[in-house]
Amino acid sequence: CDLPQTHSLGNRRALILLAQMGRISHFSCLKDRYDFGFPQEVFDGNQFQKAQAISAFHEMIQQTFNLFSTKDSSAAWDETLLDKFYIELFQQLNDLEACVTQEVGVEEIALMNEDSILAVRKYFQRITLYLMGKKYSPCAWEVVRAEIMRSFSFSTNLQKGLRRKD
């Protein structure tokens, strides 16, 4: 499966929207930094097959969608930007779903990528617990936004790599 160029552009647009969503001066949030333990090894294209990497990307975008779809998230961010962000994520989910099913049979996906999907879910679980512990404070959301931007940037670079390998 060749990930369409539009997917990469969508990922870039999602990153730009995330960057625009900041509401407070992030300089006041240094003390709220936290180690979420981004599962970098899951996205390592050298260690895992393409289908597994794509499956992990899919899970990450799905979890990002879930995280930013909550009531607490809606209260934290600008509604217009959030809606645009949802559209970009939704489009990426569609691109990746088509790609995963093309790479391997649907019934094989769940078994084959169980570990990588679980690692991504645990990562987002840590993010959710952090937000809960910080009572969804503006700084906690800023830290999470920065973290999601970093993980998106990382996966975008790897997706470029996956396209080049074809």
Epitope: F27, C29, L30, K31, D32, Y34, V143, A146, E147, R150
Partner: antibody, heavy 121, light 107 residues
């Protein structure tokens, strides 16, 4: 390879203006903040201020607030430190350094080579 | 502002010695502390971040410990290239502040 390359040494007279630069390469310039650090001759390190190139938001040390201006041009991956009126006491080595922002990553992991500013009449 | 105080200001040691430098913060900074090495005419180099994490490429003879207000940088076996000035820096809040430095000299 991540690099921060600073502009060359400057010799100025008191009262003159100056703008020094720090160009980042080998990484996403807008994903990191750029901090500025002063080191006067034979002295220690002093943090001056920082900029987020993605939106040009800045924070200054109270000691340097109003004395210098930090700016950035993300289109050319460059941060700047400027003075409108130099004093002899501004004579120092000035370093720029990369900061991970709110991410859990090493602070000031890459530094520029430094720009020596000499202010003398 | 958070004050960072290093001790000693300077020390003399021999190659192979175990060297310990301490840094004290004027208030709790959790583990938001970094250690840098600077050699004459060169830019500082990050050694340790978040109190105890070794920066990539830094020899394992360097280690950091501590949390709250008291921190330590240890060089387990001093090498000729380790003679330099060492700075601690808090990164919990602005303004970011450095210790005054500890110069490690040859005995």
């Amino acid at each position: 390879e991540v690099q921060l390359v600073q502009s060359g040494a400057e010799v100025k007279k008191p009262g003159e203006s100056l703008k020094i630069s720090c160009k980042g390469s080998g990484y996403s310039f807008t994903s990191y903040w750029i901090g500025w650090v002063r080191q006067m001759p034979g002295k220690g390190l002093e943090w001056m201020g920082i900029i987020d190139p993605s939106d040009s938001d800045t924070a200054y040390s109270p000691s340097f607030q109003g004395q210098v201006t930090i700016s950035a041009d993300k289109s050319i991956s460059t941060a700047y430190l400027q003075w409108s009126s130099l004093k002899a006491s501004d004579t120092a080595m000035y370093y720029c350094a990369r900061h991970p922002g709110l991410n859990w990553a090493p602070d000031f992991d890459y530094w520029g080579q430094g720009t020596l500013v000499t202010v003398s009449s | 502002d958070i004050q960072m105080t290093q001790s000693p200001s300077s020390l003399s040691a021999s190659v192979g010695d175990r060297v310990t430098i301490t840094c004290r913060a004027s208030q709790s900074i959790a583990e938001f502390l970094n250690w840098y090495q600077q050699k004459p005419g060169k830019a500082p180099k990050l050694l340790i971040y978040f109190a105890s994490s070794l920066q990539s490429g830094v020899p394992s003879r360097f280690s950091g410990s501590g949390s709250g207000t008291d921190f330590t940088l240890t060089i387990s076996s001093l090498q000729p290239e380790d003679f330099a000035t060492y700075y601690c820096q808090q990164s919990i809040d602005f303004p970011l502040t450095f210790g005054q430095g500890t110069k490690v000299e040859i005995k």
